[in-house]
């Protein structure tokens, strides 16, 4: 070994540079919280930097660059203090126009610590571990939102458009005509039926177990679906995120409520086989596969 | 296709009477939010004649106030419209809508749906 090889790889295995670094990324945390940080700052930015650099000459001196099983490149960790000094360089030395999304990749500067602090590596470790063997899992849970999603398509699909709509036009006034001019909130409060304090027009079906439209309105199919239009089962996309929100239990009441009153009663079946099996068995497959998976990783 | 099926027109004089019959008899008209007649005369714009909702309340055109009467037969599903002391102003080909909700077998669909229209001819 050459004797500046000797001396960084003296330097790498020492307590102090390893302490050295984990003040340096704590401080650098610091100064990233600040919210108007004076100008002065500016110059511990580059401190930082050069020690940073300082870091991976010493590593990359002490292990070679790429070339080699235990060279700096080969570790996944170093992949994190290269990007970090790249950008770093980039956004300082680069005029690159708005660079303030460039900027944003400082934050995985703090990300440095888990390379830094032994126990947080080996939970993290295990966090990867978890989600590799998570991989069977998440594709049954696809495939089984994605079927349910596409019975939701084929059961529901427009539904949820149903509307309670005013029985009194003027004389010129069509349904048609009506649904060409609807834009603004005011209009769909004019011709719509709302219950107090709703956002979105009183929903209804036509089937005799949905719900019905108070006297003076009547059923219709017209304009957006609910929550500004988020909500539906008119897409297999939409479809797919509505039934995730039942099966993470996200607001899936609401969900249930406004479907059952535009498609029918019957159809709590749907709603009742697809948390039974979304909610309460794949959310607790997913669990015990990482609970096994951190088990693995500390036996 | 959905089809309104209108009969009634024909050539009458005037102060005579003749009555307008409007059948949704397919099973896609799900539900009207009204059925109405609107009339069309030669070089003129399309007018509203007279409209009944599903609830049964009526809407007439000025003109024809106290001279026509709208009524519905829900079992048939059908639409009529009495028409009373007829004027050579009531001349025109007379057409039906139906404006609300059909079913195409997979979806709901609403809108107006039109008829193809009945002549009305009023001349001595």
């Known amino acids: 070994f050459s004797p500046l090889r000797r001396i960084s790889i003296k330097i790498l295995v020492h307590s102090l540079f390893s302490m050295l670094i984990m003040c340096t990324i704590l401080t650098n945390c610091i100064f990233m919280t600040m919210n108007n940080p004076p100008d002065w700052t500016k110059n511990v930015e580059y401190t930082f930097t050069g020690i940073y650099t300082f870091e991976s000459l010493v590593k990359i001196l002490a292990r070679g660059f790429c070339v080699g099983e235990f060279t700096f490149l080969r570790d996944p960790w170093n992949w994190l203090d290269f990007v970090v000094i790249v950008f770093a360089y980039l956004t300082e030395f680069v005029n690159l126009g708005n660079v303030s999304a460039l900027r944003t990749f400082r934050v995985l500067r703090a990300l440095k610590t888990i390379s830094v602090i032994p126990g947080l590596k080996t939970i993290v470790g295990a966090l990867i571990q978890s989600v590799k063997k998570l991989s069977d899992v998440m594709i049954l849970t696809v495939f089984c939102l994605s079927v349910f999603a596409l019975i939701g398509l084929q059961l529901f699909m427009g539904n949820l458009k149903h509307k309670c709509f005013r029985n009194s036009l003027e004389n010129n006034e069509t349904l048609e005509s009506i649904m060409n001019t609807l834009e603004s909130e005011e209009d769909f409060r004019k011709y719509f039926y709302y219950l107090e304090g709703s956002k979105d027009a009183l929903l209804c079906g036509f089937s005799t177990d949905s719900g019905q439209c108070p006297e003076g309105y009547t059923c219709v199919k017209i304009g957006r679906n609910p929550d500004y239009g988020y909500t539906s089962f008119d897409t297999f996309s939409w479809a797919f995120l509505a039934l995730f929100r039942l099966m993470t239990q996200d607001y899936w009441e609401n969900l249930y409520q406004q479907t059952l009153r535009a498609a029918g009663k019957t159809y709590m079946i749907f709603f009742v086989v697809v948390i039974f099996l979304g909610s309460f068995y794949l959310i607790n497959l997913i669990l015990a596969v990482v609970a096994m998976a951190y088990e693995e990783q500390n036996q | 296709e959905v089809q309104l099926v209108e009969s009634g027109g024909g050539v009458v004089q005037p102060g005579g009477s003749l009555r307008l019959s409007c059948a949704a008899s397919?099973?896609?008209?799900?539900?009207?939010?009204?059925t109405g007649w609107y009339r069309r005369a030669p070089g003129k714009q399309r007018e509203l004649v007279a409209r009944?909702?599903?609830?049964?309340?009526?809407q007439y055109a000025d003109s024809v106030k106290g001279r026509f009467t709208i009524s519905r037969d829900n079992a048939k599903k059908t639409v009529y419209l009495q028409m009373n002391s007829l004027r050579p102003e009531d001349t025109a080909l007379y057409y039906c809508?139906?404006?609300?909700?059909?079913?195409?077998?997979?979806?709901?669909?609403?809108?107006?749906?039109w008829g193809q229209g009945t002549l009305v001819t009023v001349s001595s």
């Open positions: 809508l139906f404006s609300g909700t059909i079913s195409t077998g997979r979806e709901y669909r609403s809108g107006d749906y």
């Open positions: 009944i909702y599903n609830e049964g309340n009526t």
């Open positions: 397919s099973r896609q008209f799900i539900r009207d939010v009204f």
